[in-house]
């Protein structure tokens, strides 16, 4: 029985972090609110303080343990509650039975680097961060390249339908500055979504050799 104007969305990063966003129309900005996590089959529970991210929206990260520790599995169910302080009491403002491996959003890929660059080509690699070993190779990636005079939104998406942590960009223009981003998504989970985009990697193609056709 939580109000229809309230929205409570959480994602598990597959290791030791659940990130939550709660929004409610007409909620008071100065109210102290928390997210409480109560797993159904674990001895621990966890709390984080919701902090405002907009006029009617709050966010927080439940840190369940060391970044690479596997704190939840596919059989876990975690009761997540938004509690807001009213005088002495905490009021339950939102509640959900959260299935972590149905609601996955991994951390953005890291350690992007140029492996090899030519006039028309660039080979780039990256690493995934804090991703569960449960996925084995069941991951996919999307990549995009920012060309001069364009926006990220205009950049065509390149899809890698397997766990491939590198890409060879082709048909690039010589002596041109580009930026590159990649994101990752597990194949598992009904409500799983793409990770945030990685930090952009800037690179420049080599100039065309003098006296040669480009």
């Amino acid at each position: 029985a939580v109000n229809g104007t309230s929205q409570f969305t959480c994602f598990y990063n597959s290791r030791a972090n659940i990130s939550c966003v709660w929004s409610q129309d007409g909620a008071l900005q100065d109210t102290s609110c928390q997210v409480h996590a109560w797993p159904d089959r674990r001895r621990w529970n966890q709390t984080c303080e919701l902090l405002p991210v907009s006029q009617a929206s709050w966010a927080c990260n439940l840190i369940l343990g060391a970044p690479d520790s596997q704190k939840l599995t596919t059989v876990d169910i975690v009761t997540l509650r938004v509690l807001c302080r009213e005088g002495v009491r905490w009021r339950v403002m939102a509640i959900q039975d959260f299935k972590p491996f149905e609601n996955l959003r991994l951390m953005a890929p890291i350690s992007l680097q140029v492996v090899h660059v030519e006039t028309h080509r660039c080979n780039i690699s990256w690493e995934i961060s804090q991703a569960s070993h449960y996925f084995e190779r069941h991951l996919e990636f999307e990549a995009r390249t920012l060309s001069p005079g364009h926006t990220w939104e205009e950049a065509p998406l390149l899809t890698l339908k397997q766990k491939q942590e590198w890409i060879c960009l082709e048909t690039l223009t010589p002596d041109t500055q580009y930026e590159f981003q990649v994101r990752v998504k597990p194949l598992q989970g009904e409500f799983t979504t793409w990770s945030p985009w990685s930090q952009p990697l800037a690179f420049r193609t080599k100039p065309a050799a003098l006296g040669k056709d480009t």
């Epitope: 029985a1 939580v2 309230s6 509690l83 009491r89 339950v92």
Partner: antibody
Framework: QVQLQQWGAGLLKPSETLSLTCAVY????????WSWIRQPPGKGLEWIGE???????NYNPSLKSRVTISVDTSKNQFSLKLSSVTAADTAVYYC???????????WGQGTLVTVSS | DVVMTQSPLSLPVTPGEPASISCRSS???????????VDWYLQKPGQSPQLLIY???NRASGVPDRFSGSGSGTDFTLKISRVEAEDVGVYYC?????????FGQGTKVEIK
């Protein structure tokens, strides 16, 4: 099984301070709200105030200037003090436990406090 | 303060028959989280009150299913589907939405 057991002086003179204590047995003290409620003879119930395990309090505005509720988590006890009592404070005083959803799910046995000169 | 008005104040009942108590509040009790913080308590003769219903319609642990609560906003009802002799006593509604929490004046249920 949660039990609340309360005690304190039952007979007071006007202007004295009422003092009651409630001990909680068989349950956790943190995560709940601990209240005092009173019932004058033959009348209805009045909420006096409540406290949580960390000591935050809510007092009924009608009594706020005279009421102090405190907690001793090491003993799983909480207490009520009501200063400058008059005959109008004669009542059965109850301690109670509350949850996030129910205001008072367990009650003490009640203590009759009579104020008379 | 929120005024809770119960009716009737006295309710003679026949065992096996249904009974109903109404409680009306002077302010809306629907919290912004969608819950009505309304409790119902029974005070049997010579005893402390005991919780019957919380959040308007949820039966407390150990309460027989002949007791049910309903309502939202300002109008709430406690129903006993078939009254038993042990159900006699004073029934109180109480609101926990607006501080200070306040009780109704009580409804005395007695066997005819």
């Amino acid at each position: 099984q949660v039990q609340l057991q309360q005690w304190g002086a039952g007979l007071l003179k006007p202007s004295e301070t009422l003092s009651l204590t409630c001990a909680v047995y068989g349950g956790s003290f943190s995560g709940y709200y601990w209240s005092w409620i009173r019932q004058p003879p033959g009348k209805g119930l009045e909420w006096i105030g409540e406290i949580n395990h960390s000591g935050s309090t809510n007092y009924n505005p009608s009594l706020k200037s005279r009421v102090t509720i405190s907690v001793d988590t090491s003993k799983n006890q909480f207490s009520l003090k009501l200063s400058s009592v008059t005959a109008a404070d004669t009542a059965v005083y109850y301690c109670a436990r509350g949850t996030d959803t129910a205001m008072a799910d367990y009650w003490g046995q009640g203590t009759l406090v009579t104020v008379s000169s | 303060d929120v005024v809770m008005t119960q009716s009737p104040l006295s309710l003679p009942v026949t065992p096996g028959e249904p009974a109903s108590i109404s409680c009306r509040s002077s302010q809306r009790l629907l919290h912004s989280n969608g819950y009505n913080y309304v409790d119902w308590y029974l005070q049997k003769p010579g005893q402390s009150p005991q919780l019957l219903i919380y959040l308007g319609s949820n039966r407390a642990s150990g309460v027989p299913d002949r007791f049910s609560g309903s309502g939202s906003g300002t109008d709430f009802t406690l129903k006993i589907s078939r009254v038993e002799a042990e159900d006699v006593g004073v029934y109180y509604c109480m609101q926990g939405t607006h501080w200070p929490w306040t009780f109704g004046q009580g409804t005395k249920v007695e066997i005819k």
